[in-house]
């Protein structure tokens, strides 16, 4: 039975050329996390594996850094980075938990961070 919840950084905005940290946190479950996948729409950005550590997709190696923790840091942001990002937690025995973050990359120098929210 899936009892866990994923808390994410929610809707966030950042400046073009800057960087942003995408974070998810799984709570309220005793399940063991074996892997976390980070995806942008249908593209795999990175994998954090409990045994093998981090793997960054080759096409994102220059602009994606692992961490902090199970999070992901996006650097040298462009307007094309605007969109949905997903953290997918693979857990035993619960299965997968998915969190959603919407990132808006702004041309202006004012970028406000949205509030945190939970996805059950």
């Amino acid at each position: 039975m899936m009892t866990g919840t994923i808390e994410t950084t929610g809707n966030i905005s950042a400046e073009k050329g800057g960087s942003i940290i995408l974070q998810c946190h799984l709570s309220s479950t005793t399940a063991q996390v074996t892997q976390v996948n980070w995806e942008q729409q249908d593209q795999l950005l990175a994998i954090c594996n409990a045994d093998l550590g981090w793997h960054i997709s080759p096409s994102f190696k220059d602009r994606v850094a692992p961490g902090p923790g199970l999070g992901l840091t996006l650097q040298s942001l462009t307007v094309n980075d605007t969109g949905e990002y997903f953290c997918i937690y693979h857990t035993y025995p619960d299965g997968t938990y998915t969190g959603r973050i919407f990132l808006e990359v702004l041309e202006s120098s004012v970028a406000e961070h949205g509030a945190r929210f939970q996805i059950p």
Partner: antibody, heavy 122, light 106 residues
Framework: QVQLVQSGSELKKPGASVKVSCKAS????????MNWVRQAPGQGLEWMGW????????TYAQGFTGRFVFSLDTSVSTAYLQISSLKAEDTAVYYC???????????????WGQGTLVTVSS | DIQLTQSPSFLSASVGDRVTITCRAS??????LAWYQQKPGKAPKLLIY???TLQSGVPSRFSGSGSGTEFTLTISSLQPEDFATYYC????????FGGGTKVEIK
């Protein structure tokens, strides 16, 4: 190589306790969940539950609460099964089994201990 | 709990035979199914996971198929070392095993 080595056979009297050990080697112990499986003589496999090797948190299947305790000693990469107030019907082979695979569609019990026979008889 | 029903419970076959074992789940489990082989006095051995993926080192005469509620394990040409008991296992929720299929020499 990756392996799980269990402690030897035990002969116990009803009411006694037993502690079965399962020592892992050849991999990072805390990265893979550990399960316990019972097989009574001539019977099939019965999942007893599992323990989170990262947090030490145990989960017990129905019928295995109360007298059964899963624990860990991560410093020696070992999982334990303790059964108290033993009954004749606890006579069985007990296996530890690692969950292999990283993504959910790869999960399976890929490495098993050799099994520990626990016989309960007066 | 998700129940798994294996059929047949017993199967008599000869070396070289094609053998098929069926596993039915009481509810849909996608492809979260594994197959194990167990010989007397030995621990079970993983043959197939994710319904159809052959575990490393397992001979290619073993194959698995199915998704949802109905699954099959096929041994294309039975070998002397294949006489054993076979179990299916679901990992869609808390794991459960089927009752087993004993493959005996005819």
């Amino acid at each position: 190589q990756v392996q799980l080595v269990q402690s030897g056979s035990e002969l116990k009297k009803p009411g006694a306790s037993v502690k079965v050990s399962c020592k892992a080697s050849g991999y990072t112990f805390t990265s893979y969940p550990m399960n316990w499986v019972r097989q009574a003589p001539g019977q099939g496999l019965e999942w007893m539950g599992w323990i989170n090797t990262n947090t030490g948190n145990p989960t017990y299947a129905q019928g295995f609460t109360g007298r059964f305790v899963f624990s860990l000693d991560t410093s020696v990469s070992t999982a334990y099964l303790q059964i108290s107030s033993l009954k004749a019907e606890d006579t069985a082979v007990y296996y530890c089994a690692r969950v292999g695979g990283y993504s959910v569609d790869e999960y399976a019990f890929d490495v098993w201990g050799q099994g520990t026979l626990v016989t309960v008889s007066s | 709990d998700i129940q798994l029903t294996q059929s047949p419970s017993f199967l008599s076959a000869s070396v070289g035979d094609r053998v098929t074992i069926t596993c039915r789940a009481s509810q849909g489990i996608s492809s979260y199914l594994a197959w194990y082989q167990q010989k007397p006095g030995k621990a079970p051995k993983l043959l197939i996971y994710a319904a159809s993926t052959l575990q490393s080192g397992v001979p290619s005469r073993f194959s698995g198929s199915g998704s949802g509620t109905e699954f099959t394990l096929t041994i294309s040409s039975l070998q002397p070392e294949d006489f054993a008991t076979y179990y299916c296992q679901q990992l869609s929720s808390y794991p459960t095993f089927g009752g087993g299929t004993k493959v005996e020499i005819k």
